[in-house]
Amino acid sequence: SEVEYRAEVGQNAYLPCFYTPAAPGNLVPVCWGKGACPVFECGNVVLRTDERDVNYWTSRYWLNGDFRKGDVSLTIENVTLADSGIYCCRIQIPGIMNDEKFNLKLVIKPAKVTPAPTRQRDFTAAFPRMLTTRGHGPAETQTLGSLPDINLTQISTLANELRDSRLANDLRDSGATIRIG
């Protein structure tokens, strides 16, 4: 089942996806698409990277993090209700059936009819999960047995919506993506 993330109309949505390259320049292709992950690639591709760079993107979709370090989280700018739905992050790891696929559900809520806030109120900063645990427990990790030089880290979902973008940034900066081994 998909992990759910929320944002308000007019705000930026953040859909997290991470992997840890074996070395800073040793990247693997990643694609983002609108719709659940299919057998290969991503459906309705909105952004993709190759072994070196972002080689395709569409307006309003960009990578805010350092993708060269494996932060391939997607930012969708100025969201509308039409942006609601399932998004696929696919990390295309060499080897037999090694691809990591994450389906993330984005829920867009109507903007609150209040004075303009001084900070972003709904920032989707929950992290993707590999297993089914929830809450604020320790990070879950998976190391690919067939490719020991590539390690993926999955972070437990934050059950409660994070409403402070500063907190979200603090979380990301505090080592949410960690190198195992």
Epitope: P38, D50, G95, D99
Partner: antibody, heavy 120, light 107 residues
Framework: QVQLQQSGPGLVKPSQTLSLTCTVS??????????WSWTRQHPGMGLEWIGY???????YYTPSLKSRLTISVDTSKNQFSLKLSSVTAADTAVYYC????????????WGQGTLVTVSS | EIVLTQSPATLSLSPGERATLSCRAS??????LAWYQQKPGQAPRLLIY???NRATGIPARFSGSGSGTDFTLTISSLEPEDFAVYYC?????????FGGGTKVEIK
């Protein structure tokens, strides 16, 4: 335009290994954007997907053949290949190689097909 | 494994007529469904991908529709070269699977 040329024996003995090669022209097999795949069709029957290898090295095999199957790429020869071990008469089929465009799947290219008969 | 059931098995029509082919999936494949055409002795040819998008070079008389579990391929006016076998294929779940095919034959 990408073109695919298949080669390999049309007759294989039971318990041996079926080996087919697909040579790519009109494009580099190592450049991004394509998935290199194999599909087969038993005589008078429908199509069965075998597996693929992507430009990034991701490999997917159909579960029923996984234990006997190897799909690989030789970038120096601009080829990709299929090896199916321990064949039986049930593996008799026309085998097709194909390339799938990963940039939206809006085109694909197929080899001419090779009829492989498994018989002693 | 997702099972794709095509109907009818055979469709007998005359040139100029409209052909409607159905493909039903045993579970949702979202819009990840393709249609192929195959003529005797030839490799399959991609017609439609992602349920409704025409592949490069495919005439406008071919159209696809549907999502989830029910899909349709429509040939608005059959040309002589359209008489062939048509297969649907899903790429939503591994393994990729094909339907059993619909043969469109000349009446």
């Amino acid at each position: 335009q990408v073109q695919l040329q298949q080669s390999g024996p049309g007759l294989v003995k039971p318990s041996q290994t079926l080996s087919l090669t697909c040579t790519v022209s009109g494009g580099s097999i190592s450049s991004g954007g394509y998935y290199w795949s194999w599909t087969r069709q038993h005589p008078g029957m429908g199509l069965e997907w075998i597996g693929y290898i992507s430009y990034s090295g991701s490999i997917y095999y159909t579960p029923s053949l996984k234990s006997r199957l190897t799909i690989s790429v030789d970038t120096s020869k601009n080829q990709f290949s299929l090896k199916l071990s321990s064949v039986t008469a049930a593996d008799t089929a026309v085998y097709y190689c194909a390339s799938l465009d990963s940039w939206g799947s809006n085109r694909d290219y197929w080899g001419q097909g090779t009829l492989v008969t498994v018989s002693s | 494994e997702i099972v794709l059931t095509q109907s009818p098995a055979t469709l007998s029509l005359s040139p100029g007529e409209r052909a409607t082919l159905s493909c039903r999936a045993s579970q949702s494949v979202s819009s990840y469904l393709a249609w192929y055409q195959q003529k005797p002795g030839q490799a399959p040819r991609l017609l439609i991908y992602d349920a409704s998008n025409r592949a490069t070079g495919i005439p406008a008389r071919f159209s696809g529709s549907g999502s989830g579990t029910d899909f349709t391929l429509t040939i608005s006016s059959l040309e002589p070269e359209d008489f062939a076998v048509y297969y649907c294929q899903q790429r939503s779940n591994w393994p990729l699977t094909f339907g059993g095919g619909t043969k469109v034959e000349i009446k």
